[in-house]
């Protein structure tokens, strides 16, 4: 049997011989060097060579446990002569012992950590952590100790687990924001004679809101014009907060002032500024100038910093409004006027008033933009603004005139303002009713005595407040011996009646029948309007069959005795 | 480089004895057996026995234990391998070769023996 | 004495094809995973050659295209694309113990 223990060797060998690790021996040796002591796997015949005769190992390279630290190799011990193994192949364990060879090594060179500032002291920072490839379970020389070489009073480190903490109270990062901590890592558990690695930690403090927001100044004093339109802005004001980010950002209000309504404050999100802006129009000649208390505050604030004061701060703003020469103004934003049509030439129908809105309250002249009445229709008294007829008018032509007036300063032609008017054309009864179209009828020979041969309708130009009344009746001159009548309907319609049985249409073929139309409106008006008559054979259902030839080709052929 | 150089062909008559040399070069002669291989014409190989040059220690085939002597000069790395009562049966080329763990490595270029009357 | 029998006595293979020769000993030649079996090739009126030892192991300088393999009792060795130059004949050798024998041989020609 093979007779050996686990080999140890210690690490980092720095004789001038090779390095003995120990022997390999079987039982079966009778030391006549019949055996071949072979070696192999981690290693041999380079880092460790065997004598074949006795089995003395040795380490030719100088080893490194923290490269390997167990080497595993096989034994064999063969017969020379014959090749015959004398026992089983054999593995074996080479063990390196360790020495202090290695220092500590940070996981990083350099560590970059935050914390907020004015944390309680003890707040952790960052853990660093440096290992030794030492081996740790033999001595102390993977044994870590951390301690602090630079960055006291500011942190501190626990000695055996590399927490970074900090170390004084109230730390300001407006005050100072970097930080640059020394850490060292010491092997042997601190003692003298250890090795030691060290490692930079980079600490930025992170802003906490610590500080309220200060306006530079107690006052601040704008002018806009009078003209500036609502959403005009008019200044910026600007906060100062000494934190950053969230932390800086500044709200804006008008908490003050007689300004209140009529201004606003808006915060530029990027700049952080509070831009006034008009809120209400403004009218120097009521008011020329406006006071504000505007106040700038911290939409997130950290309760714990409460006790530091408010988080906001009060400026007064004071807005001078200025004067602009503004157009003149009309009393109304549009007028509505009203004239007969029968106005005679020169009839002042109404008027506009404008004034200048300016202290100054220059004199206005007043026109008609011809644009809007290229007839010249109309006209105005310059001075005083009356609006008169220059052409006579026919509400049938034209209901409703729509002209613009124009009022214009006289000292500055530049300042004018335009206003419309609408004109009513009122009606007058100037119009007589008329048929409502050309009525060409017949009546059958066979025909019976007051049968209804036609319904006339008639129509007016007129437009009566009451609606129209017309009345129906023959001419005077057609009244006596007529052979129709005409029965008015009293609801704006008459029909033509026969006034006998029976036509003949050989003695007589066609009749002209004169209808006077009067309306009953004032002045009346009437017109004579005539209807023609034909005398036509018919079927016995009172269907024409035929009329005089002449009569249907000339139907306003005249003739008598209607 | 290993080399095995034996010495020239013999022609024996019966009942006599022949020894042939073989000359190692090229390696530590005592660190390795030599055997002695021979081969009779047309036949097969048959080993004969062999020698540890260190110790002089000796094996042979039963069948030649009572003709084979095999002898090592160390001072001139040479060994031989002596027959005697030599028979016709024993016309053969006889080989050196170096053993190293029961294989034969390296192999002499052979000696003709011829037993004839 | 182990006997060692080669099989078979003579092998004609075309060139470029797998030439298989196998050896059987008479009892284990095996001993602690170690075969202690051996392969060589003798050309004509050339001293042998040392291929293969310890069954499987190819000895320095072969050219690859030979193997071993097997243990105990039953050995075989192939060539595994036959060359011209390969035109020999194969022994197997046995050193697990005295006499050290040889099988009878194998002629390996071309076909």
């Known amino acids: 049997s093979w007779m050996w223990n686990q080999f140890f060797l210690l690490e980092e060998y720095t004789g001038s011989d090779y390095q003995y690790v120990g022997k390999l021996h079987s039982d079966q040796d009778r030391g006549d060097g019949s055996l071949k002591y072979i070696l192999s796997g981690d290693g041999a015949g380079d880092l460790f060579i065997i004598n074949e005769n006795t089995g003395d190992i040795q380490a030719t390279k100088r080893l490194d446990r923290e490269e390997k630290p167990v080497y595993i190799l096989r034994a064999q011990a063969i017969n020379r002569r014959t090749g015959r193994p004398v026992e089983p192949e054999s593995e074996f364990i080479i063990k390196i012992h360790d020495i202090n060879d290695n220092e500590p090594i940070f996981t990083k060179e350099v560590y970059t950590a935050t914390v907020p500032e004015m944390s309680d002291v003890g707040t952790f920072v960052v853990q660093v952590t440096a290992t030794d490839a030492d081996d740790p379970t033999y001595g102390n020389s993977a044994k870590v100790v951390y301690s602090i070489l630079q960055g006291q009073p500011y942190f501190s480190v626990e000695s055996e687990t590399g927490i970074i903490k900090t170390a004084l109270l109230n730390m300001d990062r407006e005050n100072r924001e970097q930080y640059q901590v020394v850490i060292q890592a010491k092997d042997m558990g601190g003692q003298m004679g250890g090795l030691s690695g060290t490692t930079t930690v980079n600490i930025t403090l992170t802003d906490v809101n610590d500080n309220p927001p200060r306006f530079p100044q107690s006052t601040y004093q704008f002018k806009t014009p009078e003209s500036s339109p609502p959403g005009t802005p008019i200044g910026r004001i600007k906060a100062s907060d000494a934190d950053v980010g969230e932390n800086a950002e500044i709200e804006y209000s008008i908490t003050d002032g007689e300004g209140l309504d009529m201004f606003d404050v808006i915060t530029d999100q990027e700049t952080q500024e509070g831009i006034i802006t008009v809120k209400k129009l403004l009218d120097f000649e009521k008011k020329k100038v406006y006071t504000l208390k505007v106040e700038a505050s911290n939409p997130y604030v950290e309760p714990r910093f409460l006790y530091l004061g408010p988080f906001k701060d009060s400026a007064t703003v004071r807005i001078v409004v200025e004067d602009v020469d503004e157009p003149p103004v009309f009393s109304k934003l549009a007028y509505i006027l009203q004239i007969r049509e029968d106005a005679q030439i020169n009839t002042t129908i109404g008027s506009v008033t404008a004034q200048d809105p300016d202290a100054a309250r220059n004199p206005v002249k007043y026109s008609v933009d011809r644009h809007t009445d290229m007839d010249r229709i109309f006209n105005i008294d310059s001075g005083n603004g009356s609006i008169f007829t220059s052409k006579l008018l026919d509400r049938e032509t034209l209901l409703w005139h729509n002209i613009t007036v124009i009022a214009t300063e006289i000292n500055n032609p530049k300042q004018s303002s335009r206003v419309p008017l609408y004109i009513k054309v009122l009606d007058v009864n100037d119009n007589a009713p008329e048929f409502a179209e050309f009525y060409e009828t017949f009546v059958c020979e066979k025909a019976k005595a007051d049968q209804l041969i036609q319904t006339l309708h008639a129509v007016d130009k007129d437009d009566p407040y009451s609606g129209h009344q017309f009345s129906f009746s023959l001419a005077p001159e057609a009244a006596s011996g007529s052979n129709f009548t005409i029965q008015d309907n009293k609801d704006n319609t008459a029909g033509i009646l026969t006034r006998k049985n029976g036509y003949n249409r050989h003695e007589m073929s066609t009749y002209l029948l004169p209808v006077v139309i009067s309306d009953n409106d004032y002045p009346v008006q009437s017109s004579t309007g005539t209807v023609t008559v034909r005398v036509c054979a018919c079927d016995h259902h009172g269907n024409m069959q035929s009329c005089h030839a002449e009569a249907l080709i000339h139907p306003t052929g005249l003739s008598t005795g209607a | 480089e290993v080399q095995l150089v034996q010495s020239g062909a013999e022609v024996k008559k019966p009942g006599s004895s022949v020894k042939v040399s073989c000359k190692a070069s090229g390696y530590t002669f005592t660190n390795y057996w030599m055997h002695w291989v021979r081969q009779a014409p047309g036949q097969g190989l048959e080993w004969m026995g062999d020698i540890d040059p260190s110790h002089s220690e000796t094996h042979y085939t039963q069948k030649f234990k009572d003709r084979v002597t095999i002898t090592v000069d160390k001072s001139t790395s040479t060994a031989y391998m002596e027959l005697s009562s030599l028979r016709s049966e024993d016309t053969a080329v006889y080989y050196c070769a170096r053993g190293d763990l029961g294989r034969f490595d390296y192999w002499g270029q052979g000696t003709t023996v011829t037993v004839s009357s | 004495d182990i006997v060692m029998t080669q099989s078979p006595d003579s092998l004609a293979v075309s060139l470029g094809e797998r030439a298989t020769i196998n050896c059987r000993a008479s009892e284990s030649v095996s001993i602690h995973g170690t075969h202690l079996m051996h392969w060589y090739q003798q050309k004509s009126g050339q001293p042998p050659k040392l291929l293969i030892y310890a069954a499987s192991n190819l000895e320095s300088g072969v050219p690859d295209r030979f193997s071993g393999s097997g243990s105990e009792t039953d050995f075989t060795l192939t060539i595994s694309s036959l060359q011209a130059e390969d035109v020999a004949v194969y022994y197997c050798?046995?050193?697990?113990?005295?006499?050290?024998?040889f099988g009878g041989g194998t002629k390996v020609e071309i076909k």
């Open positions: 050798q046995q050193s697990f113990e005295d006499p050290w024998t």
